[in-house]
Protein backbone atom coordinates (compact mmCIF):
# COMPACT_ATOMS: atom_id res chain seq x y z
CA UNK A 1 0.00 0.00 0.00
CA UNK A 2 1.89 3.01 -1.27
CA UNK A 3 1.59 6.52 0.04
CA UNK A 4 -0.53 8.84 -2.07
CA UNK A 5 0.58 12.46 -2.00
CA UNK A 6 -2.43 14.68 -2.51
CA UNK A 7 -2.34 18.40 -3.26
CA UNK A 8 -5.60 20.26 -2.97
CA UNK A 9 -5.83 23.70 -4.53
CA UNK A 10 -8.66 26.02 -3.61
CA UNK A 11 -9.66 28.78 -6.06
CA UNK A 12 -10.77 31.87 -4.14
CA UNK A 13 -11.82 35.29 -5.33
CA UNK A 14 -12.57 38.58 -3.62
CA UNK A 15 -15.60 40.77 -4.43
CA UNK A 16 -13.31 42.91 -6.58
CA UNK A 17 -12.46 39.89 -8.71
CA UNK A 18 -8.92 39.33 -7.46
CA UNK A 19 -8.15 35.64 -7.36
CA UNK A 20 -5.92 33.64 -5.08
CA UNK A 21 -5.11 29.98 -4.73
CA UNK A 22 -4.45 28.11 -1.53
CA UNK A 23 -2.55 24.85 -1.77
CA UNK A 24 -2.83 22.19 0.93
CA UNK A 25 -0.77 19.02 0.98
CA UNK A 26 -1.94 15.82 2.60
CA UNK A 27 -1.22 12.12 2.41
CA UNK A 28 -3.34 9.04 1.96
CA UNK A 29 -2.83 5.50 0.72
CA UNK A 30 -3.37 3.94 -2.66
CA UNK A 31 -5.68 0.98 -2.16
CA UNK A 32 -5.45 -2.31 -4.04
CA UNK A 33 -8.91 -1.60 -5.45
CA UNK A 34 -7.36 0.77 -7.96
CA UNK A 35 -4.17 1.62 -9.79
CA UNK A 36 -1.10 3.34 -8.34
CA UNK A 37 -1.17 6.22 -10.79
CA UNK A 38 -1.01 9.98 -10.73
CA UNK A 39 -4.29 11.75 -11.39
CA UNK A 40 -5.73 15.23 -11.17
CA UNK A 41 -9.00 17.00 -11.67
CA UNK A 42 -11.74 19.15 -10.23
CA UNK A 43 -13.06 17.89 -6.90
CA UNK A 44 -16.64 16.66 -6.71
CA UNK A 45 -17.97 15.82 -3.27
CA UNK A 46 -20.19 12.76 -3.50
CA UNK A 47 -22.53 11.51 -0.81
CA UNK A 48 -22.31 7.72 -0.39
CA UNK A 49 -26.03 7.42 -1.11
CA UNK A 50 -25.65 9.62 -4.18
CA UNK A 51 -23.64 6.83 -5.76
CA UNK A 52 -26.51 4.36 -5.32
CA UNK A 53 -28.89 5.54 -7.97
CA UNK A 54 -28.46 5.36 -11.71
CA UNK A 55 -30.02 8.68 -12.64
CA UNK A 56 -30.03 11.35 -15.29
CA UNK A 57 -26.97 12.98 -13.75
CA UNK A 58 -24.77 10.49 -15.59
CA UNK A 59 -24.48 12.97 -18.47
CA UNK A 60 -23.71 15.90 -16.18
CA UNK A 61 -20.05 15.12 -15.64
CA UNK A 62 -17.15 15.60 -17.97
CA UNK A 63 -14.46 12.95 -17.75
CA UNK A 64 -11.54 13.68 -15.46
CA UNK A 65 -12.80 14.82 -12.04
CA UNK A 66 -11.77 13.54 -8.62
CA UNK A 67 -14.54 12.15 -6.43
CA UNK A 68 -14.34 12.68 -2.68
CA UNK A 69 -16.57 10.44 -0.55
CA UNK A 70 -16.84 10.63 3.23
CA UNK A 71 -17.93 7.20 4.38
CA UNK A 72 -20.38 7.04 7.27
CA UNK A 73 -20.31 4.76 10.28
CA UNK A 74 -21.41 1.26 9.19
CA UNK A 75 -24.26 1.24 11.70
CA UNK A 76 -25.79 4.30 9.98
CA UNK A 77 -26.03 2.31 6.75
CA UNK A 78 -26.36 -1.36 7.76
CA UNK A 79 -27.48 -2.51 4.29
CA UNK A 80 -25.51 -0.38 1.81
CA UNK A 81 -26.73 -0.35 -1.78
CA UNK A 82 -23.16 -0.89 -2.99
CA UNK A 83 -19.92 -2.03 -1.43
CA UNK A 84 -17.19 0.57 -1.04
CA UNK A 85 -15.53 -0.89 -4.12
CA UNK A 86 -18.87 -0.71 -5.93
CA UNK A 87 -19.12 2.98 -5.06
CA UNK A 88 -15.63 3.59 -6.44
CA UNK A 89 -16.58 1.76 -9.65
CA UNK A 90 -19.76 3.82 -10.00
CA UNK A 91 -17.80 7.06 -9.64
CA UNK A 92 -15.30 5.95 -12.29
CA UNK A 93 -18.18 4.96 -14.59
CA UNK A 94 -19.47 8.52 -14.23
CA UNK A 95 -16.13 9.92 -15.31
CA UNK A 96 -13.98 10.16 -12.20
CA UNK A 97 -10.27 9.95 -12.87
CA UNK A 98 -9.71 9.06 -9.20
CA UNK A 99 -11.71 8.50 -6.02
CA UNK A 100 -10.68 9.54 -2.51
CA UNK A 101 -12.48 7.97 0.45
CA UNK A 102 -12.43 9.48 3.93
CA UNK A 103 -12.50 6.30 6.04
CA UNK A 104 -12.17 7.99 9.45
CA UNK A 105 -15.63 6.84 10.57
CA UNK A 106 -15.53 3.53 8.75
CA UNK A 107 -12.03 2.03 9.12
CA UNK A 108 -13.37 -1.38 8.05
CA UNK A 109 -13.54 0.07 4.54
CA UNK A 110 -9.74 -0.09 4.36
CA UNK A 111 -9.83 -3.88 4.39
CA UNK A 112 -12.61 -3.90 1.80
CA UNK A 113 -10.59 -1.68 -0.51
CA UNK A 114 -7.43 -3.72 -0.04
CA UNK A 115 -8.89 -7.16 -0.63
CA UNK A 116 -7.18 -8.47 -3.72
CA UNK A 117 -9.58 -7.85 -6.58
CA UNK A 118 -9.37 -9.87 -9.78
CA UNK A 119 -10.52 -6.81 -11.65
CA UNK A 120 -9.06 -3.69 -10.00
CA UNK A 121 -10.04 -0.31 -11.34
CA UNK A 122 -7.68 1.28 -13.81
CA UNK A 123 -7.88 4.56 -11.89
CA UNK A 124 -6.51 5.33 -8.41
CA UNK A 125 -8.68 4.67 -5.35
CA UNK A 126 -7.14 6.46 -2.37
CA UNK A 127 -8.18 6.49 1.27
CA UNK A 128 -7.42 9.15 3.87
CA UNK A 129 -8.07 9.27 7.61
CA UNK A 130 -7.28 11.27 10.74
CA UNK A 131 -5.76 14.73 10.39
CA UNK A 132 -5.33 14.38 6.62
CA UNK A 133 -9.01 13.56 6.20
CA UNK A 134 -9.99 16.54 8.38
CA UNK A 135 -7.86 18.83 6.19
CA UNK A 136 -9.44 17.45 3.03
CA UNK A 137 -13.01 17.65 4.26
CA UNK A 138 -12.52 21.17 5.62
CA UNK A 139 -11.74 22.25 2.07
CA UNK A 140 -14.41 20.15 0.38
CA UNK A 141 -17.12 21.23 2.81
CA UNK A 142 -16.51 24.88 1.94
CA UNK A 143 -18.08 23.99 -1.42
CA UNK A 144 -15.62 26.24 -3.16
CA UNK A 145 -13.94 25.40 -6.43
CA UNK A 146 -11.01 23.08 -5.79
CA UNK A 147 -8.74 20.74 -7.70
CA UNK A 148 -6.92 17.70 -6.45
CA UNK A 149 -3.66 16.31 -7.72
CA UNK A 150 -2.71 12.80 -6.62
CA UNK A 151 0.87 11.58 -7.01
CA UNK A 152 2.72 8.47 -5.98
CA UNK A 153 5.87 10.39 -5.15
CA UNK A 154 6.25 13.63 -3.22
CA UNK A 155 5.57 16.71 -5.37
CA UNK A 156 8.66 18.70 -6.25
CA UNK A 157 6.89 21.95 -7.04
CA UNK A 158 3.67 22.09 -5.03
CA UNK A 159 1.89 24.61 -7.24
CA UNK A 160 3.36 23.61 -10.61
CA UNK A 161 0.03 22.87 -12.30
CA UNK A 162 -1.91 25.52 -10.47
CA UNK A 163 0.15 28.67 -10.96
CA UNK A 164 -2.32 31.52 -11.12
Amino acid sequence: KETAFVEVVLFESSPSGDYTTYTTGLTGRFSRAGATLSAEGEIVQMHPLGLCNNNDEEDLYEYGWVGVVKLEQPELDPKPCLTVLGKAKRAVQRGATAVIFDVSENPEAIDQLNQGSEDPLKRPVVYVKGADAIKLMNIVNKQKVARARIQHRPPRQPTEYFDM
Epitope: S13, L60, G64, V145, Y161
Partner: antibody, heavy 120, light 107 residues
Protein backbone atom coordinates in the same frame (compact mmCIF):
# COMPACT_ATOMS: atom_id res chain seq x y z
CA UNK B 1 -30.24 21.13 -26.41
CA UNK B 2 -28.08 23.83 -24.82
CA UNK B 3 -28.96 27.32 -26.04
CA UNK B 4 -27.32 30.60 -25.09
CA UNK B 5 -28.78 33.78 -26.56
CA UNK B 6 -27.06 37.11 -25.95
CA UNK B 7 -28.80 40.49 -26.19
CA UNK B 8 -28.33 44.14 -25.31
CA UNK B 9 -25.38 45.04 -27.52
CA UNK B 10 -25.07 48.21 -29.54
CA UNK B 11 -23.21 51.46 -30.01
CA UNK B 12 -22.10 53.30 -26.89
CA UNK B 13 -19.88 56.32 -26.29
CA UNK B 14 -16.55 56.02 -24.45
CA UNK B 15 -16.94 56.42 -20.71
CA UNK B 16 -20.57 55.30 -20.75
CA UNK B 17 -22.12 52.03 -19.53
CA UNK B 18 -23.91 49.10 -21.11
CA UNK B 19 -25.42 45.88 -19.76
CA UNK B 20 -25.61 42.77 -21.92
CA UNK B 21 -27.62 39.65 -21.09
CA UNK B 22 -27.56 35.97 -21.93
CA UNK B 23 -30.69 33.83 -21.74
CA UNK B 24 -29.86 30.17 -21.15
CA UNK B 25 -31.98 27.10 -21.80
CA UNK B 26 -31.61 23.37 -22.28
CA UNK B 27 -29.70 22.72 -19.03
CA UNK B 28 -29.98 23.30 -15.29
CA UNK B 29 -28.55 26.81 -15.25
CA UNK B 30 -27.94 26.97 -11.47
CA UNK B 31 -25.59 23.94 -11.60
CA UNK B 32 -23.00 25.45 -13.91
CA UNK B 33 -20.43 28.21 -13.78
CA UNK B 34 -20.82 30.74 -16.60
CA UNK B 35 -18.50 33.16 -18.35
CA UNK B 36 -18.12 35.96 -20.88
CA UNK B 37 -15.49 35.87 -23.63
CA UNK B 38 -14.94 38.60 -26.23
CA UNK B 39 -13.46 38.81 -29.69
CA UNK B 40 -12.42 42.17 -31.10
CA UNK B 41 -12.80 42.59 -34.89
CA UNK B 42 -10.08 40.60 -36.70
CA UNK B 43 -8.52 39.74 -33.33
CA UNK B 44 -8.23 36.73 -31.06
CA UNK B 45 -10.41 35.66 -28.15
CA UNK B 46 -10.11 37.17 -24.67
CA UNK B 47 -11.64 35.84 -21.48
CA UNK B 48 -13.62 38.60 -19.73
CA UNK B 49 -15.31 37.18 -16.61
CA UNK B 50 -16.42 34.00 -14.83
CA UNK B 51 -19.03 33.44 -12.14
CA UNK B 52 -19.56 30.34 -9.99
CA UNK B 53 -22.92 28.50 -10.03
CA UNK B 54 -24.32 30.22 -6.95
CA UNK B 55 -22.87 33.59 -7.91
CA UNK B 56 -20.69 33.90 -4.81
CA UNK B 57 -17.35 34.06 -6.63
CA UNK B 58 -16.40 36.13 -9.65
CA UNK B 59 -13.15 36.27 -11.60
CA UNK B 60 -11.86 38.92 -14.05
CA UNK B 61 -8.67 39.64 -15.99
CA UNK B 62 -6.82 42.88 -15.22
CA UNK B 63 -8.05 44.48 -18.46
CA UNK B 64 -11.64 44.75 -17.17
CA UNK B 65 -11.25 44.48 -13.39
CA UNK B 66 -13.07 47.30 -11.61
CA UNK B 67 -15.03 48.26 -14.72
CA UNK B 68 -17.01 45.11 -15.60
CA UNK B 69 -19.33 43.11 -13.33
CA UNK B 70 -20.63 39.63 -14.08
CA UNK B 71 -23.83 38.53 -12.34
CA UNK B 72 -26.56 35.94 -12.72
CA UNK B 73 -30.22 35.36 -11.91
CA UNK B 74 -30.65 31.62 -11.46
CA UNK B 75 -34.44 31.95 -11.18
CA UNK B 76 -34.51 33.50 -14.66
CA UNK B 77 -31.63 31.40 -16.09
CA UNK B 78 -29.97 34.61 -17.19
CA UNK B 79 -26.37 35.79 -17.14
CA UNK B 80 -25.42 39.48 -17.20
CA UNK B 81 -22.37 41.61 -17.89
CA UNK B 82 -22.45 45.19 -16.66
CA UNK B 83 -19.81 47.23 -18.48
CA UNK B 84 -18.90 50.65 -17.06
CA UNK B 85 -16.31 53.24 -18.10
CA UNK B 86 -16.21 51.74 -21.56
CA UNK B 87 -13.19 52.29 -23.80
CA UNK B 88 -12.72 51.97 -27.54
CA UNK B 89 -10.64 48.83 -26.95
CA UNK B 90 -13.73 47.17 -25.44
CA UNK B 91 -15.28 47.06 -28.92
CA UNK B 92 -15.86 43.39 -29.59
CA UNK B 93 -18.30 40.56 -30.07
CA UNK B 94 -19.22 39.35 -26.57
CA UNK B 95 -19.92 35.63 -26.19
CA UNK B 96 -21.74 34.03 -23.30
CA UNK B 97 -20.21 30.65 -22.42
CA UNK B 98 -21.27 27.76 -20.23
CA UNK B 99 -18.61 25.96 -18.20
CA UNK B 100 -18.36 22.20 -18.11
CA UNK B 101 -19.13 20.37 -14.87
CA UNK B 102 -17.35 20.21 -12.55
CA UNK B 103 -15.17 23.29 -12.68
CA UNK B 104 -15.21 26.95 -13.59
CA UNK B 105 -12.57 27.23 -16.26
CA UNK B 106 -13.54 25.03 -19.21
CA UNK B 107 -16.12 26.39 -21.66
CA UNK B 108 -18.19 23.72 -23.38
CA UNK B 109 -20.99 25.71 -25.08
CA UNK B 110 -21.03 29.25 -26.47
CA UNK B 111 -23.69 31.64 -27.69
CA UNK B 112 -23.61 33.38 -31.06
CA UNK B 113 -22.34 36.60 -29.47
CA UNK B 114 -23.55 40.18 -29.29
CA UNK B 115 -21.68 43.13 -30.80
CA UNK B 116 -20.66 46.03 -28.59
CA UNK B 117 -19.17 49.06 -30.34
CA UNK B 118 -17.56 51.81 -28.26
CA UNK B 119 -17.14 54.94 -30.33
CA UNK B 120 -17.84 58.65 -30.17
CA UNK C 1 -0.04 35.24 -17.18
CA UNK C 2 0.31 32.14 -19.31
CA UNK C 3 0.93 32.92 -22.99
CA UNK C 4 -0.33 30.51 -25.63
CA UNK C 5 1.59 30.42 -28.91
CA UNK C 6 -0.41 28.72 -31.65
CA UNK C 7 1.05 27.58 -34.97
CA UNK C 8 0.67 27.75 -37.86
CA UNK C 9 -1.53 30.83 -38.31
CA UNK C 10 -2.66 29.58 -41.72
CA UNK C 11 -2.81 26.08 -43.08
CA UNK C 12 -3.76 24.92 -46.58
CA UNK C 13 -4.83 21.33 -47.04
CA UNK C 14 -7.00 19.08 -49.19
CA UNK C 15 -9.96 16.87 -48.34
CA UNK C 16 -8.64 13.58 -46.97
CA UNK C 17 -5.40 15.06 -45.64
CA UNK C 18 -4.12 14.63 -42.10
CA UNK C 19 -3.24 17.94 -40.45
CA UNK C 20 -1.85 19.00 -37.07
CA UNK C 21 -2.15 22.29 -35.20
CA UNK C 22 0.07 23.12 -32.24
CA UNK C 23 -0.22 25.22 -29.09
CA UNK C 24 2.73 25.96 -26.83
CA UNK C 25 2.20 27.32 -23.32
CA UNK C 26 4.70 29.61 -21.63
CA UNK C 27 4.62 27.29 -18.60
CA UNK C 28 3.33 23.88 -17.58
CA UNK C 29 -0.48 23.73 -17.80
CA UNK C 30 -0.96 20.08 -16.85
CA UNK C 31 -3.81 18.59 -18.83
CA UNK C 32 -5.90 21.75 -18.89
CA UNK C 33 -6.08 22.53 -22.59
CA UNK C 34 -9.14 22.62 -24.88
CA UNK C 35 -9.50 22.89 -28.66
CA UNK C 36 -12.31 24.77 -30.42
CA UNK C 37 -13.53 25.15 -33.99
CA UNK C 38 -15.13 28.37 -35.22
CA UNK C 39 -16.77 28.90 -38.56
CA UNK C 40 -17.22 32.44 -39.86
CA UNK C 41 -20.02 34.19 -37.99
CA UNK C 42 -20.73 31.13 -35.85
CA UNK C 43 -20.34 30.32 -32.17
CA UNK C 44 -17.15 28.45 -31.26
CA UNK C 45 -17.62 24.70 -30.82
CA UNK C 46 -15.57 22.64 -28.38
CA UNK C 47 -13.84 19.67 -29.99
CA UNK C 48 -11.46 18.41 -27.29
CA UNK C 49 -11.26 19.07 -23.57
CA UNK C 50 -8.49 18.38 -21.06
CA UNK C 51 -5.93 17.60 -23.79
CA UNK C 52 -7.39 14.42 -25.25
CA UNK C 53 -11.07 13.97 -24.35
CA UNK C 54 -13.39 14.11 -27.35
CA UNK C 55 -16.47 16.28 -26.84
CA UNK C 56 -19.72 14.33 -27.21
CA UNK C 57 -20.96 14.44 -30.80
CA UNK C 58 -17.59 15.34 -32.34
CA UNK C 59 -16.29 12.93 -35.02
CA UNK C 60 -13.41 10.65 -34.02
CA UNK C 61 -11.19 12.06 -36.78
CA UNK C 62 -10.42 14.85 -34.28
CA UNK C 63 -7.89 13.95 -31.59
CA UNK C 64 -5.75 15.79 -29.09
CA UNK C 65 -2.44 15.02 -27.45
CA UNK C 66 0.31 16.65 -25.44
CA UNK C 67 1.52 17.38 -21.93
CA UNK C 68 3.43 20.00 -20.00
CA UNK C 69 3.73 22.93 -22.40
CA UNK C 70 3.19 21.35 -25.85
CA UNK C 71 -0.19 20.32 -27.24
CA UNK C 72 -1.45 19.16 -30.64
CA UNK C 73 -4.81 18.91 -32.37
CA UNK C 74 -4.83 16.36 -35.19
CA UNK C 75 -7.50 15.96 -37.85
CA UNK C 76 -7.20 12.66 -39.69
CA UNK C 77 -8.95 12.64 -43.03
CA UNK C 78 -10.14 16.21 -43.52
CA UNK C 79 -13.78 16.67 -44.52
CA UNK C 80 -15.19 19.71 -46.38
CA UNK C 81 -16.90 20.94 -43.18
CA UNK C 82 -13.57 21.01 -41.30
CA UNK C 83 -12.28 24.09 -43.11
CA UNK C 84 -12.62 26.71 -40.37
CA UNK C 85 -10.60 28.49 -37.68
CA UNK C 86 -9.23 26.51 -34.73
CA UNK C 87 -7.98 27.81 -31.42
CA UNK C 88 -6.79 26.47 -28.09
CA UNK C 89 -7.66 27.54 -24.54
CA UNK C 90 -5.51 26.95 -21.47
CA UNK C 91 -7.65 26.65 -18.37
CA UNK C 92 -5.05 25.62 -15.86
CA UNK C 93 -5.65 28.85 -13.98
CA UNK C 94 -6.79 32.43 -14.18
CA UNK C 95 -6.44 34.44 -16.29
CA UNK C 96 -7.66 32.00 -18.92
CA UNK C 97 -5.82 32.53 -22.20
CA UNK C 98 -6.39 31.54 -25.83
CA UNK C 99 -4.15 30.77 -28.73
CA UNK C 100 -4.25 33.25 -31.61
CA UNK C 101 -6.00 30.83 -33.96
CA UNK C 102 -5.23 28.74 -37.06
CA UNK C 103 -7.21 29.29 -40.23
CA UNK C 104 -7.54 26.02 -42.13
CA UNK C 105 -8.18 26.64 -45.83
CA UNK C 106 -8.83 24.43 -48.83
CA UNK C 107 -5.75 24.02 -51.01
Amino acid sequence: EVQLVESGGGLVQPGRSLKVSCAASGFTFSTFAMAWVRQAPKKGLEWVATITPGGSNTYYPDSVKGRFTISRDNAKSTLYLQMDSLRSEDTANYYCAKCGYPGITSFDYWGQGVMVTVSS
Amino acid sequence: DIQMTQSPSFLSASVGDRVSINCKASQNIGKYLNWYQQELGEAPKRLIYNTNNLQTGIPSRFSGSGSGTDYTLTISGLQPEDFATYFCLQHNGFPLTFGSGTKLEIK
